[in-house]
Amino acid sequence: HTAAQDNCTCPTNKMTVCSPDGPGGRCQCRALGSGMAVDCSTLTSKCLLLKARMSAPKNARTLVRPSEHALVDNDGLYDPDCDPEGRFKARQCNQTSVCWCVNSVGVRRTDKGDLSLRCDELVRTHHILIDLRHRPTAGAFNHSDLDAELRRLFRERYRLHPKFVAAVHYEQPTIQIELRQNTSQKAAGDVDIGDAAYYFERDIKGESLFQGRGGLDLRVRGEPLQVERTLIYYLDEIPPKFSMKRLTA
C-alpha cells in the first residue's frame, strides 16, 4: 500500500472498499456486499455489516429469555435486505420465498411465512440486554469500576451517547449491560443501540470490525476482563407476534 491508500481506509468498518475518488479527492468507502457508501466517522449499520458478512459461517444460538417478549437471535446469519439508509427492511425473505418480519436490529419477530406476509413497519428495538459471563478471577471486580469502564467503552469506542447506557449490573460472574433508546430519544447523528451492541458482540468474540485497531482489551483497574459467554436479548417497542406453537415449544 502507498501512503495515500493507507490514508483512504474506513476506521470504523474494515468490511469496506475505499478509494480517494470522491469530490476533491475525498476518500469514499463502500460496504462489501451492498456497495453502499458508508460514513466512516461513525458505526456502520448492522444491516450493511451482516450483508458484508453473508458468506461467514452460520452461528446459531439458543438462548434463555429474560421475559416473555424478549427476542434472541436464534436464526444466526442471513443475507438481509437493507433500505437506502442501511436499515433493515421490515420484511426479509430468503431465496426460497420464505419471508418473515424483523425488528430494527434484524432479529425475526414473527413466524416465517410466504411472499404474502406483510410487515407494515420496522418495529424499533428500544431495550437491549447484554448478558455476559466473565472468566474466573482472583476476586470480584469492583462494581463501580466495572460500571465506569463499560460506560467509557460504549462512549469512546462505539460513540454511543452515555444517556443510552441505562444500567450496568454485576453479580459475579455475570455482567448485564442495559441499553435503552426510544424512537423519540434518538436524535440525528446518534449511534443506534443496535449497532453499538453488534460492534460490542463482535469485539467480545475477537472479530473486531474496526480497521487496524487492536482487538478489544477490556481491563478494570488493570485486571483483564475476559468474557467466556455472551447472550443478547432484544425488547421491541411493540411485542413480537409468534404463534402459540412457538411460544410453548
Epitope: T2, A4, Q5, N7, S19, P20, D21, P23, G24, G25
Partner: antibody
C-alpha cells in the same frame, strides 16, 4: 516532492480542438485524483472535472460536458484534457491539480488563446 | 449545484492588520471547504483544507474556521506577500464550486 508539469501555451483557431497535458511526478499517479480548473482573464475559477487514474472514473461539470474530455495515461503518469469546438469563451488559463481530501497541488497552468 | 457566496469581493488593508474573508454555501457542506491564494501569473496555492487544517508550509498567521454553511479565512497579521486573490472551494459534492474570489490589496 509532488510536481505537476503542464504543457506550453496554445494559440488555436475557432472551431478547432486542443489537447493539453499534465505530467505528474513525485507520487504514485494512480493513487490520487486530478482536477482541471479554468481561469478566464479578470474572472474567477471554474471547476471543469475530475479524473481518477486508479480506476479511470471521472466526473464533469455539466457546463463542460461535450466541451472537455479528460483522460489519463498510467504508463507516462500523464493526465490530458481535450477541448473541442473552441470559441473565444474558451480563451483562458487551464490548471490541473492533484487533490486528496481537499488538499491540492497545482500545475503552473496552460494558456489557451482562441484567435482567428 | 452548491452556490458559494464569498465576501467581500475586494478589500484594502494595512500591513499588520487582521483580515477576515467569509464564504457562505447555499447548503451545509460538512466542513468540506478549502481556501486558495492566487497571484497574477502564478498557479493557485493551497492554504487551508477541511475548513480549518493548515497546509504544510503555510504561515501560521493563516487560519480557517466555520461549520455548516458559513466559513471564514483569517490572516492574523497581514504581510506584504499576502496580497492576491483568495478563493474558497466546496468539495462536499459534485460539481465542485468556487466562491467568486476576494481581491486583497494594500491600503
Amino acid at each position: 516532492q509532488v510536481q505537476l508539469q503542464q504543457s506550453g501555451p496554445e494559440v488555436v483557431k475557432p472551431g478547432a480542438s486542443v489537447k493539453m497535458s499534465c505530467k505528474a511526478s513525485g507520487y504514485r499517479f494512480t493513487d490520487y485524483v486530478i482536477n482541471w480548473v479554468k481561469q478566464r482573464t479578470g474572472q474567477g475559477l471554474e471547476w471543469i472535472g475530475q479524473i481518477y487514474p486508479g480506476s479511470d472514473s471521472f466526473h464533469y461539470n455539466k457546463n463542460f460536458k461535450g466541451k472537455a474530455t479528460l483522460t489519463a495515461d498510467k504508463s507516462s503518469n500523464t493526465a490530458y484534457m481535450q477541448l473541442n469546438s473552441l470559441t473565444s469563451e474558451d480563451s483562458a488559463v487551464y490548471f490541473c491539480a492533484r487533490f486528496f481530501e481537499g488538499l491540492a497541488y497545482w500545475g503552473q497552468g496552460t494558456l489557451v488563446t482562441v484567435s482567428a | 449545484d452548491i452556490k458559494m457566496t464569498q465576501s467581500p469581493s475586494s478589500m484594502y488593508a494595512f500591513l499588520g492588520e487582521r483580515v477576515t474573508i467569509t464564504c457562505t454555501a447555499s447548503q451545509g457542506i460538512n466542513n468540506y471547504l478549502s481556501w486558495f491564494q492566487l497571484k497574477p501569473g502564478k498557479s493557485p496555492k493551497s492554504l487551508i483544507y477541511r475548513a480549518n487544517r493548515l497546509v504544510d508550509g503555510v504561515p501560521s498567521r493563516f487560519s480557517g474556521s466555520g461549520s455548516g454553511q458559513d466559513y471564514s479565512l483569517t490572516i492574523s497579521s497581514l504581510d506584504y506577500e499576502d496580497m492576491g486573490i483568495y478563493y474558497c472551494l466546496q468539495y462536499d459534492e459534485f460539481p465542485l464550486t468556487f466562491g467568486g474570489g476576494t481581491k486583497l490589496e494594500l491600503k
